[in-house]
Protein backbone atom coordinates (compact mmCIF):
# COMPACT_ATOMS: atom_id res chain seq x y z
CA UNK A 1 0.00 0.00 0.00
CA UNK A 2 1.19 3.55 -0.66
CA UNK A 3 2.49 5.39 2.40
CA UNK A 4 0.09 7.78 4.20
CA UNK A 5 0.00 11.25 2.77
CA UNK A 6 0.15 10.28 -0.88
CA UNK A 7 -3.33 11.70 -1.21
CA UNK A 8 -4.68 8.56 -2.78
CA UNK A 9 -7.43 6.23 -1.66
CA UNK A 10 -6.23 2.67 -1.16
CA UNK A 11 -7.88 -0.67 -0.53
CA UNK A 12 -6.69 -2.54 2.51
CA UNK A 13 -6.99 -6.30 2.77
CA UNK A 14 -4.83 -9.23 3.83
CA UNK A 15 -3.01 -10.98 1.02
CA UNK A 16 -4.19 -14.35 2.29
CA UNK A 17 -7.20 -15.49 4.32
CA UNK A 18 -7.61 -19.01 5.72
CA UNK A 19 -11.01 -20.66 6.01
CA UNK A 20 -12.10 -24.12 7.07
CA UNK A 21 -13.86 -26.61 4.89
CA UNK A 22 -17.60 -26.50 5.57
CA UNK A 23 -17.32 -23.37 7.71
CA UNK A 24 -17.87 -19.73 6.84
CA UNK A 25 -15.12 -17.19 6.31
CA UNK A 26 -14.97 -13.43 5.94
CA UNK A 27 -12.81 -11.90 3.23
CA UNK A 28 -11.95 -8.50 4.77
CA UNK A 29 -11.67 -5.51 2.44
CA UNK A 30 -11.70 -1.83 3.38
CA UNK A 31 -11.25 1.46 1.61
CA UNK A 32 -8.79 3.77 3.33
CA UNK A 33 -9.35 7.42 2.51
CA UNK A 34 -6.81 10.09 3.51
CA UNK A 35 -8.14 12.79 5.84
CA UNK A 36 -8.53 15.60 3.34
CA UNK A 37 -9.49 13.44 0.38
CA UNK A 38 -13.07 13.43 -0.88
CA UNK A 39 -14.29 10.25 -2.49
CA UNK A 40 -17.62 8.72 -3.27
CA UNK A 41 -18.08 4.97 -3.65
CA UNK A 42 -20.79 3.93 -6.06
CA UNK A 43 -20.12 0.20 -6.20
CA UNK A 44 -18.35 -2.68 -4.49
CA UNK A 45 -17.45 -5.71 -6.56
CA UNK A 46 -16.00 -9.12 -5.82
CA UNK A 47 -14.75 -11.31 -8.64
CA UNK A 48 -12.86 -14.54 -8.79
CA UNK A 49 -9.78 -14.81 -10.95
CA UNK A 50 -10.35 -16.75 -14.10
CA UNK A 51 -14.13 -16.39 -14.00
CA UNK A 52 -16.15 -13.99 -16.08
CA UNK A 53 -18.56 -11.69 -14.32
CA UNK A 54 -18.80 -10.76 -10.67
CA UNK A 55 -19.70 -13.04 -7.81
CA UNK A 56 -20.97 -10.22 -5.61
CA UNK A 57 -21.87 -6.60 -6.30
CA UNK A 58 -23.13 -3.92 -3.92
CA UNK A 59 -24.49 -0.93 -5.77
CA UNK A 60 -24.99 2.39 -4.02
CA UNK A 61 -28.62 2.61 -5.14
CA UNK A 62 -29.58 -0.99 -5.94
CA UNK A 63 -27.99 -2.79 -3.02
CA UNK A 64 -26.46 -6.28 -3.20
CA UNK A 65 -26.61 -8.95 -5.86
CA UNK A 66 -24.89 -12.31 -5.69
CA UNK A 67 -24.02 -15.16 -8.02
CA UNK A 68 -24.87 -17.55 -5.17
CA UNK A 69 -27.17 -15.70 -2.80
CA UNK A 70 -27.26 -18.46 -0.18
CA UNK A 71 -23.49 -18.58 0.14
CA UNK A 72 -22.46 -14.92 -0.02
CA UNK A 73 -23.19 -11.82 2.03
CA UNK A 74 -21.75 -8.34 2.36
CA UNK A 75 -21.17 -8.04 6.08
CA UNK A 76 -21.14 -4.27 6.47
CA UNK A 77 -22.35 -2.57 3.28
CA UNK A 78 -25.76 -0.99 3.68
CA UNK A 79 -27.99 1.07 1.42
CA UNK A 80 -27.86 4.74 2.26
CA UNK A 81 -24.54 4.43 4.10
CA UNK A 82 -21.04 5.32 3.00
CA UNK A 83 -19.51 2.32 1.29
CA UNK A 84 -16.13 1.88 2.92
CA UNK A 85 -16.26 -1.77 3.96
CA UNK A 86 -16.59 -4.35 1.22
CA UNK A 87 -15.93 -7.37 3.45
CA UNK A 88 -17.67 -10.45 2.09
CA UNK A 89 -18.75 -13.52 4.03
CA UNK A 90 -18.73 -16.91 2.34
CA UNK A 91 -20.72 -19.77 3.81
CA UNK A 92 -20.21 -23.53 3.52
CA UNK A 93 -16.66 -23.38 2.22
CA UNK A 94 -15.83 -25.92 -0.45
CA UNK A 95 -12.48 -27.07 -1.78
CA UNK A 96 -13.19 -25.39 -5.09
CA UNK A 97 -13.60 -22.02 -3.33
CA UNK A 98 -9.85 -21.87 -2.85
CA UNK A 99 -8.30 -19.28 -5.13
CA UNK A 100 -7.64 -15.63 -5.83
CA UNK A 101 -10.37 -13.05 -5.37
CA UNK A 102 -10.42 -9.38 -6.32
CA UNK A 103 -12.15 -6.84 -4.12
CA UNK A 104 -12.86 -3.69 -6.11
CA UNK A 105 -14.22 -0.28 -5.12
CA UNK A 106 -15.56 2.01 -7.82
CA UNK A 107 -14.79 5.43 -6.38
CA UNK A 108 -15.39 8.89 -7.75
CA UNK A 109 -13.40 10.68 -8.93
CA UNK A 110 -10.44 8.43 -8.12
CA UNK A 111 -11.62 5.49 -10.21
CA UNK A 112 -11.24 1.78 -9.55
CA UNK A 113 -9.29 0.66 -6.54
CA UNK A 114 -8.77 -3.03 -6.01
CA UNK A 115 -6.81 -5.62 -4.13
CA UNK A 116 -6.32 -9.36 -4.54
CA UNK A 117 -6.91 -11.83 -1.72
CA UNK A 118 -5.93 -15.48 -1.75
CA UNK A 119 -8.50 -17.67 0.00
CA UNK A 120 -6.97 -20.81 1.47
CA UNK A 121 -9.45 -23.57 2.22
CA UNK A 122 -8.11 -25.61 5.11
CA UNK A 123 -9.26 -28.78 6.83
CA UNK A 124 -7.95 -29.47 10.32
CA UNK A 125 -6.63 -33.03 10.47
CA UNK A 126 -7.22 -35.49 13.29
CA UNK A 127 -4.01 -37.06 14.50
CA UNK A 128 -3.33 -40.41 16.11
CA UNK A 129 -0.19 -42.34 16.93
CA UNK A 130 0.08 -45.98 17.85
CA UNK A 131 2.73 -48.54 18.54
CA UNK A 132 3.35 -51.38 16.09
CA UNK A 133 4.19 -54.28 18.38
CA UNK A 134 7.02 -56.31 16.86
CA UNK A 135 9.25 -59.27 17.53
CA UNK A 136 12.95 -59.55 16.92
CA UNK A 137 13.26 -59.81 13.17
CA UNK A 138 16.83 -58.82 12.46
CA UNK A 139 15.70 -56.39 9.78
CA UNK A 140 14.01 -52.96 9.78
CA UNK A 141 10.26 -53.03 10.44
CA UNK A 142 7.62 -50.38 11.29
CA UNK A 143 7.63 -49.91 15.04
CA UNK A 144 5.33 -46.89 15.31
CA UNK A 145 2.60 -45.43 13.13
CA UNK A 146 1.40 -41.84 13.03
CA UNK A 147 -1.71 -40.91 11.04
CA UNK A 148 -2.98 -37.40 10.24
CA UNK A 149 -6.48 -37.84 8.84
CA UNK A 150 -8.39 -35.46 6.56
CA UNK A 151 -6.00 -32.52 6.41
CA UNK A 152 -5.91 -29.81 3.78
CA UNK A 153 -3.23 -29.17 2.81
CA UNK A 154 -1.54 -32.45 3.83
CA UNK A 155 -0.01 -32.36 7.30
CA UNK A 156 3.76 -32.61 7.70
CA UNK A 157 4.86 -35.52 9.90
CA UNK A 158 8.33 -35.85 11.40
CA UNK A 159 9.73 -38.22 14.00
CA UNK A 160 11.98 -37.39 16.92
CA UNK A 161 13.99 -40.08 18.67
CA UNK A 162 17.42 -40.82 20.09
CA UNK A 163 17.20 -44.30 18.64
CA UNK A 164 17.75 -43.43 14.99
CA UNK A 165 15.11 -44.96 12.78
CA UNK A 166 13.80 -44.00 9.37
CA UNK A 167 10.41 -42.55 8.46
CA UNK A 168 8.28 -43.91 5.63
CA UNK A 169 5.49 -41.50 4.79
CA UNK A 170 2.62 -41.92 2.36
CA UNK A 171 -0.55 -40.04 1.41
CA UNK A 172 -4.02 -41.08 0.31
CA UNK A 173 -7.13 -38.99 -0.40
CA UNK A 174 -9.19 -38.22 2.68
CA UNK A 175 -12.86 -38.96 3.23
CA UNK A 176 -13.81 -35.42 2.27
CA UNK A 177 -12.95 -34.33 -1.25
CA UNK A 178 -9.75 -32.33 -1.39
CA UNK A 179 -8.46 -33.57 1.94
CA UNK A 180 -5.49 -35.87 2.46
CA UNK A 181 -4.66 -38.54 5.01
CA UNK A 182 -0.96 -38.81 5.75
CA UNK A 183 0.47 -41.98 7.28
CA UNK A 184 4.02 -42.12 8.55
CA UNK A 185 5.72 -45.29 9.75
CA UNK A 186 8.79 -45.17 11.96
CA UNK A 187 11.13 -47.99 10.93
CA UNK A 188 13.95 -49.58 12.93
CA UNK A 189 15.60 -52.94 13.48
CA UNK A 190 13.90 -54.20 16.65
CA UNK A 191 16.05 -54.96 19.67
CA UNK A 192 15.41 -55.56 23.31
CA UNK A 193 17.13 -52.27 24.10
CA UNK A 194 14.39 -50.38 22.22
CA UNK A 195 11.51 -51.97 24.12
CA UNK A 196 9.76 -49.47 26.40
CA UNK A 197 11.53 -46.49 24.90
CA UNK A 198 9.60 -43.49 23.52
CA UNK A 199 9.53 -41.92 20.08
CA UNK A 200 7.63 -38.73 19.29
CA UNK A 201 5.54 -38.04 16.22
CA UNK A 202 5.38 -34.32 15.39
CA UNK A 203 2.47 -33.18 13.22
CA UNK A 204 2.56 -29.70 11.69
CA UNK A 205 -0.35 -28.05 9.89
CA UNK A 206 -1.42 -24.53 8.91
CA UNK A 207 -4.50 -24.91 11.08
CA UNK A 208 -2.49 -25.61 14.25
CA UNK A 209 -1.27 -22.84 16.51
CA UNK A 210 1.68 -25.06 17.37
CA UNK A 211 2.77 -28.53 16.25
CA UNK A 212 1.02 -31.50 17.85
CA UNK A 213 3.34 -33.95 19.58
CA UNK A 214 2.23 -37.55 20.02
CA UNK A 215 4.39 -39.93 22.04
CA UNK A 216 4.57 -43.63 21.26
CA UNK A 217 5.91 -46.18 23.76
CA UNK A 218 7.69 -48.84 21.72
CA UNK A 219 6.99 -52.52 22.21
CA UNK A 220 9.41 -55.24 21.16
CA UNK A 221 8.54 -58.83 22.03
CA UNK A 222 11.67 -60.90 22.73
CA UNK A 223 12.60 -64.06 24.62
CA UNK A 224 14.34 -63.77 27.95
CA UNK A 225 17.83 -62.38 28.22
CA UNK A 226 19.28 -64.14 31.24
CA UNK A 227 22.20 -63.59 33.60
CA UNK A 228 22.96 -64.75 37.15
CA UNK A 229 24.20 -62.32 39.78
CA UNK A 230 25.25 -62.60 43.40
CA UNK A 231 28.54 -64.49 43.06
CA UNK A 232 31.89 -62.73 43.43
CA UNK A 233 34.34 -65.68 43.21
CA UNK A 234 35.06 -65.32 46.92
CA UNK A 235 32.99 -67.99 48.65
CA UNK A 236 34.60 -70.01 51.40
CA UNK A 237 33.75 -72.79 53.73
CA UNK A 238 32.08 -71.67 56.90
CA UNK A 239 30.32 -68.68 55.41
CA UNK A 240 26.72 -67.97 56.08
CA UNK A 241 24.18 -68.76 53.38
CA UNK A 242 24.27 -66.74 50.18
CA UNK A 243 21.75 -65.88 47.45
CA UNK A 244 22.07 -65.99 43.70
CA UNK A 245 19.61 -64.09 41.53
CA UNK A 246 18.52 -65.06 38.04
CA UNK A 247 18.18 -61.71 36.24
CA UNK A 248 15.86 -61.92 33.23
CA UNK A 249 14.70 -59.21 30.82
CA UNK A 250 11.91 -60.20 28.48
CA UNK A 251 8.68 -59.08 26.85
CA UNK A 252 6.26 -60.43 27.74
CA UNK A 253 7.30 -60.99 31.35
CA UNK A 254 8.86 -64.33 32.32
CA UNK A 255 6.37 -67.05 33.13
CA UNK A 256 8.76 -69.36 34.95
CA UNK A 257 12.24 -69.84 36.39
CA UNK A 258 13.91 -73.23 36.58
CA UNK A 259 17.18 -73.87 38.40
CA UNK A 260 19.38 -76.88 37.70
CA UNK A 261 22.96 -77.88 37.27
CA UNK A 262 24.90 -79.34 34.42
CA UNK A 263 24.75 -82.60 36.31
CA UNK A 264 20.97 -82.53 36.61
CA UNK A 265 18.86 -81.53 39.60
CA UNK A 266 20.02 -79.11 42.24
CA UNK A 267 22.24 -80.43 45.04
CA UNK A 268 20.84 -80.34 48.61
CA UNK A 269 22.71 -77.12 49.52
CA UNK A 270 20.89 -75.18 46.78
CA UNK A 271 17.25 -74.28 47.27
CA UNK A 272 15.28 -72.62 44.42
CA UNK A 273 12.98 -69.73 45.37
CA UNK A 274 11.64 -68.48 42.05
CA UNK A 275 14.19 -66.15 40.52
CA UNK A 276 16.47 -66.63 43.48
CA UNK A 277 18.64 -69.56 44.53
CA UNK A 278 19.53 -69.93 48.19
CA UNK A 279 23.00 -71.44 48.78
CA UNK A 280 23.22 -72.96 52.26
CA UNK A 281 26.55 -73.28 54.14
CA UNK A 282 28.60 -76.29 53.13
CA UNK A 283 31.28 -78.19 55.02
CA UNK A 284 33.35 -79.35 52.08
CA UNK A 285 34.59 -77.57 48.95
CA UNK A 286 32.32 -77.62 45.90
CA UNK A 287 32.64 -76.77 42.21
CA UNK A 288 29.24 -76.78 40.54
CA UNK A 289 27.86 -75.19 37.37
CA UNK A 290 24.39 -73.84 38.04
CA UNK A 291 21.82 -73.22 35.30
CA UNK A 292 18.91 -70.80 35.40
CA UNK A 293 16.34 -71.41 32.67
CA UNK A 294 13.76 -68.66 32.13
CA UNK A 295 10.62 -69.05 30.04
CA UNK A 296 8.22 -66.52 28.49
CA UNK A 297 5.63 -66.71 25.72
CA UNK A 298 8.31 -66.52 23.07
CA UNK A 299 10.61 -69.19 24.36
CA UNK A 300 13.18 -70.14 26.95
CA UNK A 301 16.71 -68.95 27.48
CA UNK A 302 19.26 -69.94 30.12
CA UNK A 303 22.38 -68.71 31.83
CA UNK A 304 25.14 -70.73 33.49
CA UNK A 305 27.37 -69.87 36.44
CA UNK A 306 30.16 -71.99 37.89
CA UNK A 307 30.27 -71.60 41.67
CA UNK A 308 33.26 -72.61 43.77
CA UNK A 309 33.28 -72.84 47.55
CA UNK A 310 36.90 -72.90 48.61
CA UNK A 311 38.81 -73.67 51.82
CA UNK A 312 40.08 -70.69 53.71
CA UNK A 313 39.35 -68.59 56.77
CA UNK A 314 36.02 -66.82 56.22
CA UNK A 315 37.01 -63.89 58.42
CA UNK A 316 39.64 -62.82 55.89
CA UNK A 317 37.19 -62.74 52.98
CA UNK A 318 33.89 -61.21 52.17
CA UNK A 319 31.11 -63.21 50.55
CA UNK A 320 28.08 -61.89 48.70
CA UNK A 321 24.65 -62.26 50.20
CA UNK A 322 25.80 -63.72 53.51
CA UNK A 323 23.19 -63.26 56.25
Amino acid sequence: WPPPGTGDVVVQAPTQVPGFLGDSVTLPCYLQVPNMEVTHVSQLTWARHGESGSMAVFHQTQGPSYSESKRLEFVAARLGAELRNASLRMFGLRVEDEGNYTCLFVTFPQGSRSVDIWLRVLAKPQNTAEVQKVQLTGEPVPMARCVSTGGRPPAQITWHSDLGGMPNTSQVPGFLSGTVTVTSLWILVPSSQVDGKNVTCKVEHESFEKPQLLTVNLTVYYPPEVSISGYDNNWYLGQNEATLTCDARSNPEPTGYNWSTTMGPLPPFAVAQGAQLLIRPVDKPINTTLICNVTNALGARQAELTVQVKEGPPSEHSGISRN
Epitope: T6, G7, E37, H40, S42, Q60, T61, V106, P109, G111
Partner: antibody
Amino acid sequence: QVQLVQSGAEVKKPGASVKVSCKASGYTFTSSYISWVRQAPGQGLEWIAWIYAGTGDTNYNQKFTGRVTMTTDTSTSTAYMELRSLRSDDTAVYYCARHGYTGRGWYFAVWGQGTTVTVSS
Amino acid sequence: QAVVTQEPSLTVSPGGTVTLTCRSSTGAVTTSNLANWVQQKPGQAFRGLIGHTNNRAPGVPARFSGSLLGDKAALTLSGAQPEDEAEYYCALWYSNKFVFGGGTKLTVL
Protein backbone atom coordinates in the same frame (compact mmCIF):
# COMPACT_ATOMS: atom_id res chain seq x y z
CA GLN B 1 -26.94 8.49 -27.79
CA VAL B 2 -26.00 10.17 -24.51
CA GLN B 3 -27.22 13.74 -24.39
CA LEU B 4 -27.43 16.54 -21.86
CA VAL B 5 -29.84 19.37 -22.68
CA GLN B 6 -29.72 22.48 -20.53
CA SER B 7 -32.30 25.14 -19.89
CA GLY B 8 -32.21 28.50 -21.67
CA ALA B 9 -30.33 31.70 -20.91
CA GLU B 10 -31.14 33.68 -17.78
CA VAL B 11 -30.73 37.32 -16.89
CA LYS B 12 -30.74 38.07 -13.16
CA LYS B 13 -30.23 41.00 -10.86
CA PRO B 14 -27.53 40.99 -8.20
CA GLY B 15 -28.72 39.24 -5.03
CA ALA B 16 -31.20 37.06 -6.92
CA SER B 17 -31.05 33.28 -7.46
CA VAL B 18 -30.90 31.21 -10.60
CA LYS B 19 -31.75 27.54 -11.12
CA VAL B 20 -30.33 25.86 -14.21
CA SER B 21 -31.57 22.46 -15.35
CA CYS B 22 -29.79 19.66 -17.22
CA LYS B 23 -31.94 16.90 -18.70
CA ALA B 24 -30.15 13.60 -19.39
CA SER B 25 -31.03 10.93 -21.90
CA GLY B 26 -29.43 7.87 -23.45
CA TYR B 27 -28.02 6.29 -20.29
CA THR B 28 -28.90 5.19 -16.76
CA PHE B 29 -29.24 8.50 -15.00
CA THR B 30 -29.20 7.13 -11.44
CA SER B 31 -25.74 5.60 -11.89
CA SER B 32 -24.11 8.81 -13.05
CA TYR B 33 -21.97 11.57 -11.62
CA ILE B 34 -22.70 15.04 -12.96
CA SER B 35 -20.40 18.01 -12.52
CA TRP B 36 -21.28 21.65 -13.00
CA VAL B 37 -18.62 23.88 -14.53
CA ARG B 38 -18.73 27.52 -15.50
CA GLN B 39 -16.79 29.75 -17.88
CA ALA B 40 -16.79 33.49 -17.36
CA PRO B 41 -16.33 35.67 -20.45
CA GLY B 42 -12.72 35.46 -21.66
CA GLN B 43 -11.80 33.13 -18.78
CA GLY B 44 -11.00 29.47 -18.32
CA LEU B 45 -13.24 26.81 -16.84
CA GLU B 46 -14.14 26.72 -13.16
CA TRP B 47 -15.47 23.60 -11.44
CA ILE B 48 -18.42 24.20 -9.13
CA ALA B 49 -19.53 20.81 -7.77
CA TRP B 50 -20.54 17.26 -8.52
CA ILE B 51 -23.58 15.20 -7.63
CA TYR B 52 -24.23 11.45 -7.69
CA ALA B 53 -27.62 11.24 -9.33
CA GLY B 54 -28.65 7.99 -7.66
CA THR B 55 -28.46 9.25 -4.09
CA GLY B 56 -28.06 13.00 -4.37
CA ASP B 57 -24.68 12.84 -2.65
CA THR B 58 -22.74 16.01 -3.45
CA ASN B 59 -19.33 17.60 -3.20
CA TYR B 60 -19.02 21.37 -3.58
CA ASN B 61 -16.08 23.58 -4.40
CA GLN B 62 -15.62 25.43 -1.10
CA LYS B 63 -15.64 28.69 -3.00
CA PHE B 64 -19.36 28.14 -3.65
CA THR B 65 -20.38 26.45 -0.40
CA GLY B 66 -23.49 28.04 1.03
CA ARG B 67 -24.45 29.69 -2.25
CA VAL B 68 -24.93 26.69 -4.49
CA THR B 69 -27.23 23.68 -4.22
CA MET B 70 -27.28 20.73 -6.56
CA THR B 71 -30.23 18.37 -6.80
CA THR B 72 -31.57 15.68 -9.11
CA ASP B 73 -35.02 14.51 -10.07
CA THR B 74 -34.67 10.85 -11.01
CA SER B 75 -38.22 10.66 -12.33
CA THR B 76 -37.32 13.09 -15.12
CA SER B 77 -33.57 12.32 -15.27
CA THR B 78 -32.84 15.97 -14.63
CA ALA B 79 -30.06 17.60 -12.62
CA TYR B 80 -30.41 21.10 -11.21
CA MET B 81 -27.96 23.70 -10.02
CA GLU B 82 -29.22 26.64 -8.00
CA LEU B 83 -26.91 29.58 -7.34
CA ARG B 84 -28.01 32.18 -4.81
CA SER B 85 -26.93 35.69 -3.88
CA LEU B 86 -25.83 36.36 -7.42
CA ARG B 87 -23.05 38.87 -8.11
CA SER B 88 -21.89 40.38 -11.34
CA ASP B 89 -18.83 38.08 -11.38
CA ASP B 90 -21.22 35.10 -11.51
CA THR B 91 -21.92 36.09 -15.12
CA ALA B 92 -20.80 33.04 -17.09
CA VAL B 93 -21.84 30.14 -19.22
CA TYR B 94 -22.80 27.26 -16.90
CA TYR B 95 -22.25 23.71 -18.13
CA CYS B 96 -23.35 20.33 -16.80
CA ALA B 97 -21.04 17.43 -17.63
CA ARG B 98 -21.59 13.73 -17.15
CA HIS B 99 -18.59 11.77 -16.01
CA GLY B 100 -17.88 8.60 -17.96
CA TYR B 101 -16.09 5.54 -16.63
CA THR B 102 -13.55 3.58 -18.64
CA GLY B 103 -13.15 0.67 -16.26
CA ARG B 104 -10.21 2.23 -14.48
CA GLY B 105 -10.92 5.91 -14.23
CA TRP B 106 -13.39 8.70 -14.79
CA TYR B 107 -13.36 11.43 -17.38
CA PHE B 108 -15.52 14.45 -18.31
CA ALA B 109 -17.47 12.59 -20.97
CA VAL B 110 -20.50 14.42 -22.28
CA TRP B 111 -21.25 18.11 -21.80
CA GLY B 112 -24.42 20.11 -22.07
CA GLN B 113 -24.62 22.95 -24.57
CA GLY B 114 -24.26 25.49 -21.77
CA THR B 115 -26.62 28.00 -20.16
CA THR B 116 -25.68 31.66 -20.20
CA VAL B 117 -26.41 33.42 -16.91
CA THR B 118 -26.06 37.20 -16.95
CA VAL B 119 -26.07 39.08 -13.67
CA SER B 120 -26.75 42.76 -14.24
CA SER B 121 -28.54 45.52 -12.44
CA GLN C 1 -5.42 27.97 -3.80
CA ALA C 2 -3.97 25.74 -6.52
CA VAL C 3 -3.39 27.26 -9.92
CA VAL C 4 -3.15 25.11 -13.06
CA THR C 5 -1.11 26.52 -15.92
CA GLN C 6 -1.20 25.57 -19.60
CA GLU C 7 0.54 26.98 -22.68
CA PRO C 8 -1.82 29.68 -23.99
CA SER C 9 -1.29 28.59 -27.59
CA LEU C 10 0.63 26.05 -29.66
CA THR C 11 0.93 25.40 -33.38
CA VAL C 12 1.51 22.08 -35.09
CA SER C 13 1.84 21.08 -38.72
CA PRO C 14 -0.58 18.50 -40.14
CA GLY C 15 0.88 15.06 -39.44
CA GLY C 16 3.20 16.53 -36.82
CA THR C 17 3.44 15.82 -33.11
CA VAL C 18 2.76 18.29 -30.33
CA THR C 19 2.69 18.01 -26.55
CA LEU C 20 0.44 20.15 -24.38
CA THR C 21 1.36 20.37 -20.72
CA CYS C 22 -0.42 21.06 -17.50
CA ARG C 23 1.54 22.42 -14.54
CA SER C 24 0.41 22.61 -10.92
CA SER C 25 1.39 25.48 -8.63
CA THR C 26 1.50 23.08 -5.66
CA GLY C 27 4.30 20.89 -7.02
CA ALA C 28 4.67 17.91 -9.26
CA VAL C 29 1.57 16.50 -10.86
CA THR C 30 1.04 12.85 -9.86
CA THR C 31 -1.47 10.15 -10.73
CA SER C 32 -3.40 11.23 -7.63
CA ASN C 33 -4.26 14.44 -9.49
CA LEU C 34 -6.34 12.36 -11.92
CA ALA C 35 -5.43 14.59 -14.85
CA ASN C 36 -8.32 15.07 -17.28
CA TRP C 37 -8.16 16.59 -20.74
CA VAL C 38 -11.15 18.21 -22.45
CA GLN C 39 -11.45 19.46 -26.01
CA GLN C 40 -13.65 22.27 -27.31
CA LYS C 41 -13.85 22.84 -31.02
CA PRO C 42 -15.20 26.18 -32.23
CA GLY C 43 -18.98 26.22 -32.11
CA GLN C 44 -19.17 22.71 -30.62
CA ALA C 45 -19.74 21.29 -27.14
CA PHE C 46 -16.91 20.23 -24.89
CA ARG C 47 -15.74 16.66 -25.25
CA GLY C 48 -13.74 14.54 -22.81
CA LEU C 49 -10.54 13.06 -24.23
CA ILE C 50 -8.50 11.66 -21.36
CA GLY C 51 -9.23 10.77 -17.76
CA HIS C 52 -7.14 9.44 -14.93
CA THR C 53 -3.89 10.74 -16.47
CA ASN C 54 -3.72 8.31 -19.38
CA ASN C 55 -7.11 6.65 -19.94
CA ARG C 56 -8.40 7.50 -23.35
CA ALA C 57 -12.16 7.97 -23.53
CA PRO C 58 -14.12 5.66 -25.83
CA GLY C 59 -14.17 6.91 -29.40
CA VAL C 60 -11.15 9.16 -28.98
CA PRO C 61 -8.55 8.53 -31.69
CA ALA C 62 -5.35 6.75 -30.67
CA ARG C 63 -3.31 9.78 -31.79
CA PHE C 64 -4.30 11.39 -28.47
CA SER C 65 -2.42 10.08 -25.43
CA GLY C 66 -2.09 11.27 -21.85
CA SER C 67 0.91 10.88 -19.59
CA LEU C 68 3.03 12.42 -16.87
CA LEU C 69 6.03 14.25 -18.28
CA GLY C 70 8.47 15.24 -15.59
CA ASP C 71 6.47 17.16 -13.03
CA LYS C 72 3.60 17.95 -15.39
CA ALA C 73 0.65 16.21 -16.96
CA ALA C 74 0.85 16.02 -20.72
CA LEU C 75 -1.41 15.49 -23.70
CA THR C 76 0.46 14.34 -26.79
CA LEU C 77 -1.06 14.55 -30.22
CA SER C 78 0.83 12.37 -32.72
CA GLY C 79 -0.06 12.86 -36.36
CA ALA C 80 -2.14 16.00 -35.99
CA GLN C 81 -5.19 16.41 -38.21
CA PRO C 82 -6.82 19.69 -39.26
CA GLU C 83 -9.92 18.72 -37.26
CA ASP C 84 -7.80 18.64 -34.10
CA GLU C 85 -7.66 22.44 -34.11
CA ALA C 86 -9.41 23.34 -30.86
CA GLU C 87 -9.09 24.65 -27.33
CA TYR C 88 -7.76 22.04 -24.91
CA TYR C 89 -8.31 22.23 -21.16
CA CYS C 90 -6.72 20.14 -18.46
CA ALA C 91 -8.29 19.59 -15.05
CA LEU C 92 -6.46 18.38 -11.95
CA TRP C 93 -8.01 16.93 -8.79
CA TYR C 94 -6.84 18.39 -5.48
CA SER C 95 -8.28 16.10 -2.79
CA ASN C 96 -11.70 17.76 -2.78
CA LYS C 97 -12.07 19.74 -6.00
CA PHE C 98 -11.16 19.92 -9.65
CA VAL C 99 -9.16 22.89 -10.88
CA PHE C 100 -9.05 23.65 -14.60
CA GLY C 101 -6.20 25.22 -16.46
CA GLY C 102 -6.66 28.31 -18.61
CA GLY C 103 -6.66 26.23 -21.79
CA THR C 104 -4.35 25.87 -24.77
CA LYS C 105 -5.41 27.09 -28.18
CA LEU C 106 -4.01 24.54 -30.65
CA THR C 107 -3.64 25.58 -34.27
CA VAL C 108 -3.00 23.00 -36.97
CA LEU C 109 -1.25 24.92 -39.71
